[in-house]
Interface confidence: medium
């Protein structure tokens, strides 16, 4: 019996589900909105997606690159086959997709892999189709694809009409942008005749140096500056002062960068790591670090047991006072994105913690029973329970609520994995702020 696909629908009427699927140039973009639920969902999904994509699998390599003969069949896990495979007619085997011909992006129970997209004439192939990822096509230089006409690439205009100036170049996603000289209002309609032609080089794909880009840049810089000043002035600063020696006074350190670097920190980085850890909500105790698989670099800092012990020194008071919030990097809708991530949580949260976690999140025993009965299979159970939680809690369901519940249960490793995945996938980023004021 099929209860759902891998990720079931979110709220009714919702249109796009932004899951870990093929990112082609033709997709629509969700509008900006950053509720806390988004943070939670995105975090979860991203976690898994980047874990999958961080490792170069045999299927991702072209046939001539493969080190050993490809295993064509394996057994399904919980009735699902991994990315790069589809399920056999009898449901007993997972069969590999054919490189360059078809693909599957996620755990699935499809009888056929999806056919690879062929780039149209007028498009360039940004990345080829592998068994786990569809072809990514992009308009050639000098042309663009609008959301209104996703089927074809259109030629960019060569210049702006009289009385207007060019503020945005031609990119594969947009025509040149023109604004009125005096008012600075954007021109969106078609240009009848180009008189005072301001030529644009059709090259420079995706050069985001438009007026809006500058405004956004300045705004972001201002916010960063305010946050930096706040950090430097806060009580936390007093604790950190002996170590910082000039990060806030122009020493140029970048704790975020160190935090997410893929190398093991050297001795000279330890002080900086300690500082960063004070600002972080999540620390991983020694014994859990040892259990963690020493993955290849995935954008997450690996600490030695000694170092991780050292990171635990800051008191709980500091932790509650300063908290680094996970916010979606793409400004998508939190609730929508959250739902899409649930499918991956089953792989990150130990099975015996599923029910305690859901109780902690506020589901009643009866609701948990109903969810278990509705679930299509074992792996589906956590997904179904989380959906119930979001339906019940609405906008109050957030990434942080979920992460805090895991922390309370002592599932710090699961919490860390989810956070790391969200960050390394690029879907989430840290926002510094007060724990109580910024949780929205």
């Amino acid at each position: 019996m099929e209860q759902r696909g891998q990720n079931a629908p979110a709220a009714s009427g919702a249109r796009k589900r932004h899951g870990p699927g093929p990112r082609e140039a033709r997709g629509a973009r969700p509008g900006p909105r950053v509720p806390k639920t988004l943070v939670l969902v995105v975090a979860a999904v991203l976690l898994l997606v980047s874990a999958e994509s961080a490792l170069i699998t045999q299927q991702d390599l072209a046939p001539q690159q493969r080190a050993a003969p490809q295993q064509k069949r394996s057994s399904p896990s919980e009735g699902l086959c991994p990315p790069g495979h589809h399920i056999s007619e009898d449901g007993r085997d997972c069969i590999s997709c054919k490189y360059g011909q078809d693909y599957s992006t996620h755990w699935n129970d499809l009888l056929f892999c999806l056919r690879c997209t062929r780039c149209d004439s007028g498009e360039v192939e940004l990345s080829p189709c592998t068994t786990t990822r569809n072809t990514v096509c992009q308009c050639e230089e000098g042309t663009f694809r609008e959301e209104d006409s996703p089927e074809m690439c259109r030629k960019c205009r060569t210049g702006c009409p009289r009385g207007m100036v060019k503020v945005g170049d031609c990119t594969p996603w947009s025509d040149i942008e023109c604004v009125h000289k005096e008012s600075g209002t954007k021109h969106s309609g078609e240009v009848p005749a180009v008189e005072e032609t301001v030529t644009s080089s059709p090259g420079t794909p995706a050069s985001p140096c438009s007026l809006s880009g500058i405004i956004i840049g300045v705004t972001v810089a201002a916010v960063v500056l305010i946050v930096a000043v706040f950090v430097c002035k806060s009580l936390l600063w007093k604790k950190v002062l002996p170590y910082l020696k000039g990060i806030c006074s122009g020493g140029g350190g970048d704790p975020e960068r160190v935090d997410r670097s893929s190398q093991r920190p050297g001795a000279e980085d330890n002080v900086l790591n300690e500082i960063v850890s004070i600002l972080q909500p999540t620390q991983v105790p020694e014994q859990e670090m040892e259990v963690q698989e020493p993955a290849e670099p995935t954008g997450v800092n690996m600490l030695s047991p000694g170092e991780s012990e050292h990171l635990l020194e800051p008191a709980e008071a500091e932790r509650s006072q300063r908290r680094r919030l996970l916010v979606p990097a793409n400004e998508g809708d939190p609730t929508e994105t959250l739902r899409q991530c649930f499918d991956d949580f089953a792989d990150l949260v130990p099975f015996d913690s599923w029910e305690p976690l859901m109780r902690k999140l506020g589901l009643m025993d009866n609701e948990i029973k109903v969810a278990k009965a509705e679930a299509a299979g074992h792996r589906d159970t956590l997904y179904t329970m989380l959906i119930k939680w979001v339906n019940k809690t609405g906008r109050d369901a957030s990434v942080h609520t979920l992460l805090d519940a895991l922390e309370t249960l002592g599932e710090r490793l699961a919490k860390q994995k989810i956070e790391d995945h969200l960050l390394s996938s690029g879907k989430f980023m840290y926002l510094e702020g007060n724990a109580d004021s910024a949780m929205s």
Partner: nanobody
Framework: EVQLVESGGGLVQPGGSLRLSCAAS????????IGWVRRAPGKGEELVAR????????RYADSVKGRFTISADTSKNTAYLQMNSLRAEDTAVYYC?????????WGQGTLVTVSS
């Protein structure tokens, strides 16, 4: 812009029939699976049927096997769900969705009410 628009829902008596349509735009249905998912009041989502228009492969939930038929007309870029022998428990909002091993785009849904 990718869009899925459902139509054909309504009120029907038990044992009656309805045909739902799902008009897709912004992508070619031949390139994906198309599924019909329903959400009944107080129940979870159920994937009732899906089709891979490229080769006509279909699959159904046990609860609708033999009663529902999913089909697609690739020339019209439209998928259909023919629902026969309808029961009260088929009452739900039916969504058409694009399926890439998980559903990424959804329609707004069409309400099907089976009641005497």
């Amino acid at each position: 812009e990718v869009q899925l628009v459902e139509s054909g829902g309504g009120l029907v008596q038990p044992g009656g029939s309805l045909r739902l349509s799902c008009a897709a735009s912004g992508f070619n249905i031949k390139d994906t699976y198309i599924g019909w998912v329903r959400r009944a009041p107080g129940k979870g989502e159920e994937l009732v049927a899906r089709i891979y228009p490229t080769n006509g492969y279909t699959r159904y939930a046990d609860s609708v096997k033999g009663r529902f038929t999913i089909s697609a007309d690739t020339s019209k870029n439209t998928a259909y769900l023919q629902m026969n022998s309808l029961r009260a428990e088929d009452t739900a909002v039916y969504y058409c969705a694009r399926y890439w091993s998980y559903f990424d785009y959804w329609g707004q849904g069409t309400l099907v009410t089976v009641s005497s």
